[in-house]
């Protein structure tokens, strides 16, 4: 902390503008008025302030504001937001989404942050749920955003919001979350016609059910192997090879370069074997014929 | 150690560009700004401005504004100093040289990059 | 601007002896630096907040002053330090180094 000294005469700073970059740490402490520096807050922006010069003017900031900032403020920290602390933005009440994007920017093209994750924690709860124009607007910055919440936080997502989200914002969720999104996808996308309905639903497939995806295979849809590799191996394992050689269509093909990784191996295991060779693809594993098949979970639940 | 490398000698004509470059090592290159001094055949130091490496801020000498550009490149932790419309009186050393500690002087320079502007 | 005089242009001493640069700046100045350079070399920084020694620079080195008026002392000079001195305000934008003040052997 920069120690109290008097401003030397004719250092007191009238404004915030370039003359300051030549100021001591000291100097700033003494002759750069909080009140002003709060007023003129966009300006430290375009200044090649050092970081330690930065740190005094957060300092300053503090003093005056020892509850925290006010969004007036909050709006044009530029650069100094990058050094907020989660403790000092946990104090803060952000309510606009312009302020929101304004200190997103700052942090542009770098991993998200312990001060940004706490920024976006504090907006959203403020909110109250996570709404479009927020999500269109997180999902732009961190594309990973969404499947960095739990199951619990996407249920608080309204179908409605689900439109903002591309495939890329999905690459990293998990199967847990994908469960809580898919039926909201399908909510959003009710009306959408079929080959409209898949594009926009393919991404979310990996949440689907099994008889969503026997209800797909009757859609002449072509779904990729890479789409189809990413489904719930629980919901694909009933799924007949007619049923797949519908819902995959030409991609068919690709099923015995997958083989041996989940879920293609799971489901070939479940086949009887002539049904699998009518596809012509030489997938071997499948049950023999003459072979009964029991479904024991089955016999369990009805005992 | 602090090394601050530029790129070598430069011969230009009147009115075009010329671009500086100055690599640093040595330390965390977003942590201390980086200035520009140019030095005239005999002549003195003449600070020409300033850049902030981690936000690409800047602070240029009145006399060289509209003409001077410094830009920085983290990835490679190169500043750039870019001076167009150049005329005779701009034949000069340029020196990178590293802000210290609290405005503690220029204790790193770089070994200059000597301009001629010549038709 | 700030303007910063050095003087005098030329000091011829011998080694040995105490030399004494000054500079004046046209306007109060809260810091002065201080730097050495010869001939195709880059400037080295000496002295650093008026009166603190940088890195690696001999205790023969010494700053004073404050205000308009400082000052660079050179206790018993050594035949490496005969070189150009210029002394820099740290105090407004721009700044400004004073026109040199070269330092030869008599």
């Known amino acids: 902390e920069v120690e109290k000294t008097a401003c030397p005469s004719g250092k007191k700073a009238r404004e915030i503008d370039e003359s300051l970059i030549f100021y001591k740490k000291w100097e700033l402490e003494a002759c750069v008025d909080a009140a002003l520096l709060a007023t003129q807050m966009d300006r430290v922006n375009a200044i090649p302030f050092t970081y330690e010069q930065l740190d005094v003017l957060k300092h300053k900031l503090d003093e005056l504001y020892p509850q925290g900032y006010p969004e007036s403020v909050i709006q044009h920290l530029g650069y100094l937001f990058l050094k907020m602390s989660p403790e000092d933005i946990r104090k803060w009440n952000v309510t606009s989404l312009e302020t929101l994007k304004a200190l997103l920017e700052v942090n542009k093209g770098h991993e998200m942050s312990p001060q940004v994750a706490t920024l976006i924690d504090r907006f959203v709860k403020g909110r109250g749920q996570l709404d479009k124009d927020t999500l269109d607007t997180l999902t732009a910055f961190y594309p990973g955003y969404l499947c960095s919440l739990s199951p619990e936080e996407l249920s608080s997502v309204p179908p409605s919001s689900i439109w903002a989200v591309r495939p890329q914002d999905l690459d990293t969720c998990d199967p847990r979350q994908l469960d809580v999104l898919y039926p909201k996808a399908r909510l959003a996308f009710q009306n959408m016609n079929g080959s409209e309905y898949f594009v926009k639903i393919q991404s979310f497939l990996g949440g689907a059910p099994t008889e969503d995806l026997k209800a797909l295979s009757q859609q002449n849809v072509s779904m990729d192997l890479a789409t189809f590799m990413k489904l719930r191996t629980d919901a694909v394992l009933p799924l007949t090879v007619a049923e797949v050689q519908k819902l995959l269509g030409p991609h068919v093909e690709g099923l015995k370069a997958e083989e041996r990784h989940r879920p293609v191996r799971d489901w070939i295991l479940r086949q009887r074997q002539d049904d699998l060779d009518t596809l012509g693809l030489g997938l071997q594993g499948g049950i023999p014929n003459g072979y009964l098949v029991l479904d024991l979970s089955m016999q369990e639940a009805l005992s | 150690q602090v090394q601050l490398v530029q790129s070598g000698a430069e011969v230009k004509k009147p009115g075009a560009s010329v671009k500086v470059s100055c690599k640093a090592s040595?330390?965390?290159?977003?942590?201390?700004?980086m200035n520009w001094v140019r030095q005239a055949p005999g002549q003195g130091l003449e600070w020409m401005g300033v850049?902030?490496?981690?936000?690409?801020?800047?602070s240029y000498n009145q006399k060289f504004k509209g003409r001077v550009t410094m830009t920085r490149d983290t990835s490679t932790s190169t500043v750039y100093m870019e001076l167009s419309s150049l005329r005779s009186e701009d034949t000069a050393v340029y020196y990178c040289?590293?802000?210290?500690?609290?405005?503690?002087?220029?204790?790193?320079w770089g070994q200059g990059t000597l301009v001629t502007v010549s038709s | 601007e700030i303007v910063l005089t050095q003087s005098p242009a030329t000091l011829s001493l011998s080694p040995g002896e105490r030399a004494t640069l000054s500079c004046s700046a046209s306007s109060s100045v809260s810091y002065m630096h201080w730097y050495q350079q010869k001939p195709g070399q880059a400037p080295r920084l000496l002295i650093y907040?008026?009166?603190k020694l940088a890195s690696g620079i001999p205790a023969r080195f010494s700053g004073s002053g404050s205000g308009t008026d400082f000052t660079l002392t050179i206790s018993s000079l050594e035949p490496e330090d005969f070189a150009v001195y210029y002394c820099?305000?740290?105090?407004?934008?721009?700044?400004?180094f004073g026109q040199g003040t070269k330092l030869e052997i008599k």
């Open positions: 820099q305000q740290w105090s407004s934008n721009p700044l400004t």
């Open positions: 907040d008026t009166s």
């Open positions: 040595g330390y965390t290159f977003t942590d201390y700004n």
């Open positions: 850049i902030n490496p981690n936000y690409g801020t800047t």
């Open positions: 040289a590293r802000g210290d500690y609290d405005g503690a002087g220029f204790a790193y």
